[in-house]
């Protein structure tokens, strides 16, 4: 059992109090992390508590204010970006959120050499994306779906694209589906390492069907939001990649990068772009049926001013048991020879590991191996490769940082983090300075998070960047629940679970059980991280036992578990939650008449199917913003796991796996269905169809909609949501208010 957080024993039990819902909604026990904004090997920027932007020099130990809070405040800046030549800073204000990553903003350029804002040729507003070149102070930005370039901030802009059109053609920024399901960024342009070239994607959404929903606002008539959104089987965006010489942009203009022939023969996606040198670029492409990925290395041909992608530099990654990659196809990390690279993909045993590719994928040298998975390659230097994995002590829900010395033979491996703060820290990420001279470690738990600075050569800890002392003190008089992470072995499947137990847990007593589920492909819920959240409150104050279970389809435990759900979503994920509940009942401390399940998004889908499983296990449950039919969800995500909703492909399972098909089975459970009406991601349509099916089946249920709220149900809706769900659960479990 992991007691969290560790603290001095307080004999005066009466000074301890349980968590309240108010604590959670107010974010009273939220933690801070410290990610340095590296600007060189030994310098980083950080926004101080009083909002000054401060430069820290690790070598000298000195700090310098580079931008005062007054300057930030003068334009209401909420973010900043320093040009690599240190001459200018952009200040970002008027932030206006669009989708998950995208937003528009107003940008001001501040000249650090004279302490004044740049006047003349000011940037238009609002801008969709803006970034500095990696060297100097060139600016690339996207305005009204077109890309512009400035050689210096005060110069007039050079317009690179002219065909940009709202909801039709997107240049340098992704459309909805590429943003959410493929790139996971707000941008689709990439500078070459020294800023000579600028690569960008053009997305043509002209033929994509549009999702339309009402935004009620305050006006007499609601607005209609229209988003080109390809649902499963629908027409997809057409993508093209161009590269322009930023030194002489008007000379030959943008040059298109050719698509590999084996990809171009049918519908395809562009998945990522990685610059290798100023004249070599690596593009990754994916067939619409997402089990074949091609990595293509292209070179600039000076004589023709074009980009050449020889077949000999095409590397194919194919999955025969599922889809290519994990959630996404991994990206390469190139070595110093500018042709060979390191990449994570499945080994012959079906575990994702680091491989070194020098000529062909077939001849790849496996760098890591074992019945665990390499998760992320952070940095490759001339003598070291830093990566994270869940190898240590065979807990898939942990993350430790490792260093492999690639300069020596045979390469030696060292766990950098495994024994640093073993009880407190088992889940790390890292942030490296140039050439990995220094790095920051951010530990997320299971104890109170802590961020530390380390020497990249010796791994020695230099200083603590953030240790959340205030949080530690605030928690001293709180009765936190106990947490345990264990596993169940069922029919050759390992089900890892996290159980959150009331503070005075007594194995001889019976407790209501709440299952919190996500369960989406390549997700992981059972992680050794710190959190004081709604379920912490339910355990601490309301005496519930909460369990999270990672079943089939979840990540980082090998392809057998991951790809088990391929082409049959909604079956094994549900089965495994039910199996786990039965095992929990066998443990003897669960009141089997008071078991509930809840989930959000994919979790809402799984919780709905579990409630409608006809097992009689669940008394009640909640689905927040659930998917109800895979025909309603985005093509890129859905087809990755389900194939196409066509007769000759997988239409039958698309139809069999809907929540609506099981409407009758909700008759014997209490069901609370919740959705935001302005959900751009999982459309309100999903819940509308569940509700219609339940009404048609004359099944009683409870529902709550949140007007004009998206998939995140943020702001005041959050408070209302958790208060409402708490009342529902307490009523279901017969707990007094």
């Amino acid at each position: 059992i992991v007691l969290r957080p560790s603290r001095v024993h307080n004999s005066e039990e009466n000074t301890m109090r349980a968590l309240t819902l108010k604590d959670i909604l107010n974010g009273t026990f939220s933690y801070k992390t410290f990610f340095p904004n590296w600007i060189s090997g030994q310098e980083y920027l950080h926004q101080s508590a009083d909002n000054n932007i401060v430069l820290y020099n690790i070598e000298t130990g000195q700090s310098y204010t580079i931008l005062s809070n007054r300057t930030m405040k003068s334009v209401n800046a909420s973010n900043y970006g320093l040009s690599p030549d240190r001459q200018f800073v952009y200040l970002e204000s008027d932030y206006s959120k669009l989708w998950r990553y995208s937003y528009t903003a107003t940008y001001y350029i501040y000249d650090l050499s004279n302490g004044e804002f740049v006047r003349g040729n000011e940037l238009p507003r609002p801008i969709q994306y803006l970034c500095w070149s990696p060297v100097g102070s060139k600016l690339a930005y996207v305005y009204q779906n077109n890309i512009y370039l400035k050689q210096r901030p005060g110069d007039p802009p050079f317009q690179i694209t002219f065909n940009g059109r709202e909801n039709k053609i997107f240049n340098g920024i992704p459309d909805w589906v590429y943003e959410e399901e493929m790139l996971a960024t707000k941008y689709a342009l990439w500078w070459s390492p020294n800023g000579k070239f600028l690569a960008y994607a053009e997305f043509n959404d002209t033929d994509i069907p549009v999702i339309a929903y009402s935004y009620y606002g305050d006006e007499q008539y609601p607005r209609t939001i229209n988003i080109p959104y390809p649902k499963a089987g629908a027409k997809n965006p057409v993508v093209r990649i161009f590269i322009i010489d930023t030194t002489y942009p008007a000379y030959v203009g943008p040059q298109e990068v050719p698509v590999p022939a084996m990809i171009a023969s049918s519908d395809y996606y562009f998945s990522w772009l990685t610059w290798v040198t100023d004249e070599r670029v690596c593009l990754q492409w994916l067939k619409r049926v997402q089990n074949v990925s091609v990595l293509s290395i292209c070179d600039f041909r000076e004589d023709w001013q074009t980009w050449d992608c020889p077949k000999t530099q095409e590397h194919i990654e194919e999955s025969r048991t599922g889809w290519a990659g994990g959630f996404f196809v991994s990206t390469p990390v190139f070595s110093y020879d500018a042709i060979s690279y390191y990449k994570i993909f499945s080994d012959k045993d079906g575990y994702k590991h680091i491989h070194y590719i020098k000529d062909t994928v077939e001849n790849a040298i496996q760098i890591t191996s074992g019945k665990w998975e390499a998760i992320n390659i952070f940095r490759v230097t001339q003598d070291s490769l830093f990566y994270s994995s869940n190898e240590f002590e065979e807990y898939p829900g942990r993350r430790n940082i490792y260093r492999i010395s690639i300069g020596s033979y045979p390469p030696s491996k060292k766990c950098v983090t495994c024994h640093l703060r073993k009880e407190r820290c088992q889940y790390y990420t890292a942030s490296f300075s140039d050439y990995a001279k220094y790095y920051a470690l951010v530990c997320y738990g299971p104890g109170i998070p802590i961020s530390t600075l380390h020497d990249g050569r010796t791994d020695q800890e230099i200083k603590i960047l953030e240790e959340n002392k205030e949080l530690e003190n605030a928690l001293k008089n709180i009765q936190l629940p106990k947490e345990e992470i264990k596993k169940l072995e069922v029919d050759e499947i390992t089900l890892w679970y996290k159980m959150i137990l009331p503070p005075q847990f007594d194995r001889s007593k019976k407790y209501p059980l709440l299952i919190q589920v996500y369960g989406g492909p390549c997700s992981q819920s059972v992680r050794s991280v710190f959190a004081v959240n709604w379920i912490s409150y339910l355990a601490s104050k309301e005496g519930m036992v909460i369990a999270l279970v990672d079943g089939r389809g979840t990540a980082f435990q090998g392809d057998k578990l991951l790809y088990a759900v391929y082409r049959k979503l909604g079956v094994y994920e549900v089965e495994d939650q039910i199996t786990a509940v039965r095992k929990f009942i066998e443990m003897g401390f669960i009141d089997e008449k008071r078991i509930a399940i809840w989930g959000w998004s994919y979790g809402g889908y799984v919780s709905s199917l579990a409630l409608a499983s006809g097992t009689g296990l669940f008394k009640c449950g909640i689905a927040v913003a659930p998917v109800s039919s895979w025909e309603y969800y985005a093509s890129v995500y859905t087809e990755r796991f389900m194939g196409l909703p066509t007769k000759d492909d997988n239409l039958e399972h698309y139809k069999n796996s809907t929540v609506m098909a099981r409407a009758e089975y909700f008759r014997n459970v209490d069901y609370l269905l919740i959705h935001g009406t302005a959900d751009d991601n999982v459309h309100f349509q999903n819940s509308a169809q569940i509700a219609k099916a339940l009404v048609n089946a004359q099944v009683d249920f409870q529902a709550m909609w949140y007007s004009d709220q998206n998939h995140g149900l943020s702001g005041l809706s959050t408070n209302h949501l958790y208060t409402h769900m708490t009342h529902f659960l307490k009523q279901c479990f017969s707990l007094s208010d």
Epitope: N52, V54, Q62, S68, L82
Partner: antibody
Framework: QVQLVQSGAEVKKPGASVKVSCKAS????????MDWVRQAPGKSLEWIGD????????IYNQKFKGRVTMTIDKSTSTVYMELSSLRSEDTAVYYC????????????WGQGTTVTVSS | EIVLTQSPATLSLSPGERATLSCRAS??????????INWFQQKPGQPPRLLIY???NRGSGIPARFSGSGSGTDFTLTISSLEPEDFAVYFC?????????FGGGTKVEIK
């Protein structure tokens, strides 16, 4: 406009201490570090150290470690540099200089304070 | 510490001529693509004045005839056409490593 006004000339005996002041105006003191540099007669310049006004954090040239102390009085926008255990070779013009951290450059200088160490 | 050597010690030129001042560092002062070499001008009885920072960036109010270049260990200050007020002592200085150090100076005098 930016001005750094230093205290007047000092004559000190060997072994004594000297405290030179530098009053900043025309900008917000806490926005820039203050460095101190000295110049012996007919010689080049020598960096003494740096102070970060927000926290009072300092870095000193190892050569002066243990003998130099830099402090700040935010209420009067004044920075002080004290040098102890003076010897004849400390005779020099002492300058305070505004240090622009992002460029590691000393962009504005005080008029200088002449310190003479003589028995 | 990093030692900066300036040459020549004295440069005798006439107004209108081009002046090229050299500064050599005992070790590289490159910091990940940036070189923190600064140049100062000093006239008798006055404090130094910042001319060039970060190798090639002109300080506030510095005329365009002053330019800086170089990387690694070798740096140059160029005055394209000497004006009467340019006759002074010029110092290079590195801020790449503590202690920050100055060169011995180059005196530009009227021929």
């Amino acid at each position: 406009q930016v001005q750094l006004v230093q205290s007047g000339a000092e004559v000190k005996k060997p072994g004594a201490s000297v405290k030179v002041s530098c009053k900043a105006s025309g900008y917000t003191l806490t926005d820039y570090n203050m460095d101190w540099v000295r110049q012996a007669p007919g010689k080049s310049l020598e960096w003494i150290g740096d102070i970060y006004p927000n926290t009072g954090g300092t870095i000193y040239n190892q050569k002066f470690k243990g003998r130099v102390t830099m402090t700040i009085d935010k209420s009067t926008s004044t920075v002080y540099m004290e040098l102890s255990s003076l010897r004849s070779e400390d005779t020099a013009v002492y300058y305070c200089t505004r240090f622009r951290g992002i460029h590691y450059a000393m962009d504005y200088w005080g008029q200088g304070t002449t310190v003479t160490v003589s028995s | 510490e990093i030692v900066l050597t300036q040459s020549p010690a004295t440069l005798s030129l006439s107004p209108g001529e081009r002046a090229t001042l050299s500064c050599r560092a005992s070790e590289s002062v490159d910091n990940y693509g940036l070189s923190f070499i600064n140049w100062f001008q000093q006239k008798p009885g006055q404090p130094p004045r910042l001319l060039i920072y970060g190798t090639s960036n002109r300080g506030s109010g510095i005329p365009a005839r002053f330019s800086g270049s170089g990387s690694g260990t070798d740096f140059t200050l160029t005055i394209s056409s000497l004006e009467p007020e340019d006759f002074a002592v010029y110092f290079c200085q590195q801020s790449n490593e503590v202690p920050y150090t100055f060169g011995g100076g180059t005196k530009v005098e009227i021929k």
